[in-house]
């Protein structure tokens, strides 16, 4: 059974992931980003189901495409280079989903824009955090 300290750690990691995803969304999804329209041409795959930490496997598999989109953005939009930002997210995702169980991600049929993709995973983080508090 999860201890209160492990639950707290999970909550903090989810909050960190949430902040990173929100920062990316805010950094790109505004009219001051001249490459927004180009970024919206990128296709992202969405999870069929995202209700548990193991489903973060689906986010992990889309981190490389996410980095490619962020490479279009001006570095001033974020406090870190895209490679470092994605690396940080990857570390959190690996810790949260755990590496001992192998989970095959199932994707929904419909693809999504980067804005829809980020909003989906932001909602996921908020939902899991709410169950932990």
């Amino acid at each position: 059974a999860p201890t209160s300290s492990s639950t707290k750690k999970t909550q903090l990691q989810l909050e960190h992931l949430l902040l990173d995803l929100q920062m990316i969304l805010n950094g790109i999804n505004n009219y001051k980003n001249p490459k927004l329209t180009r970024m919206l041409t990128f296709k992202f795959y969405m999870p069929k189901k995202a209700t548990e930490l193991k489903h973060l496997q689906c986010l992990e598999e889309e981190l490389k495409p996410l980095e490619e989109v962020l490479n279009l953005a001006q570095s001033k939009n974020f406090h870190l280079r895209p490679r470092d930002l994605i690396s940080n997210i990857n570390v959190i995702v690996l810790e949260l989903k755990g590496s001992e169980t192998t989970f095959m991600c199932e994707y929904a049929d419909e693809t999504a824009t980067i804005v829809e993709f980020l909003n989906r995973w932001i909602t996921f983080c908020q939902s899991i955090i709410s169950t932990l508090t």
Partner: antibody, heavy 118, light 109 residues
Framework: QVQLVQSGGGWQPGRSLRLSCAAS????????MNWVRQAPGKGLEWVTL????????YYADSVKGRFTTSRDNSKNTLYLQMNSLRAEDTAVYYC????????????WGQGTMVTVSS | SYELTQPPSVSVSPGQTARITCSGD??????AYWYQQKSGQAPVMVIY???KRPPGIPERFSGSSSGTMATLTITGAQVEDEADYYC???????????FGGGTKLTVLG
């Protein structure tokens, strides 16, 4: 309604020309803008992109160093300054608005013909 | 440089289904957009994000994408659909805006 009205095309024996695109019906200063051209009987070719405030500009290789895009947000107007014109620049030039929700151009001007003769 | 490849022309009789394809190496990871351009007019978007229809576009226009191929389908083509159709997307890095060469749709009335 949302509109882009173009002016400034014409016949040019080489040299320079400036195109204008007047925007109305939307907050011009909130949108990145483009120029797209179409040579007679040919397809569409993206030419240049300018950010909402004019601070960032991007050009197709075919016009780099010769064309300059600019904007005056106080006048809701986009410009394309074309220098060192070549015969292959002969085309209909369209101004087009970058969508902030779709990954493409959602509003287009009516187009203006530029003819370059050597 | 990145290219989107379309057939130069497609012909159908009124009421038939017209299919226009667009091929590009980056399309598995890029959305395709479709523009209709009638003679002497500016282009009008008829499909965005592979398969979505902007407001005001008739239901007979639909789009799909699989692998490196995007397809514009006009089910029950009408004489007024006669136009040039261009697919649009960006290269793999997203930096270069690219139009296909265009397809002339003839509706044999």
């Amino acid at each position: 309604q949302v509109q882009l009205v173009q002016s400034g095309g014409g016949w040019q024996p080489g040299r320079s020309l400036r195109l204008s695109c007047a925007a109305s019906g939307f907050t011009f200063s909130n949108y990145a803008m483009n120029w797209v051209r179409q040579a007679p009987g040919k397809g569409l070719e993206w030419v240049t992109l300018i950010s909402y405030d004019g601070s960032q500009k991007y050009y197709a290789d075919s016009v780099k160093g010769r064309f300059t895009t600019s904007r005056d947000n106080s006048k809701n107007t986009l410009y394309l300054q074309m220098n060192s014109l070549r015969a292959e620049d002969t085309a209909v030039y369209y101004c087009a608005r970058d969508s902030t929700t779709l990954g493409a151009f959602d509003v287009w001007g009516q187009g203006t013909m530029v003819t370059v003769s050597s | 440089s990145y290219e989107l490849t379309q057939p130069p022309s497609v012909s159908v009789s009124p009421g038939q289904t017209a299919r226009i394809t667009c091929s590009g190496d980056a399309l598995p990871r890029k959305f395709a957009y479709w523009y209709q351009q009638k003679s002497g007019q500016a282009p009008v978007m008829v499909i965005y994000e592979d398969s979505k229809r902007p407001p005001g576009i008739p239901e007979r226009f639909s789009g799909s994408s699989s692998g490196t191929m995007a397809t514009l389908t006009i089910t029950g083509a009408q004489v007024e659909d006669e136009a040039d159709y261009y697919c649009y997307s960006t290269d793999s890095g997203g930096d270069v805006s690219v139009f296909g060469g265009g397809t002339k749709l003839t509706v044999l009335g």
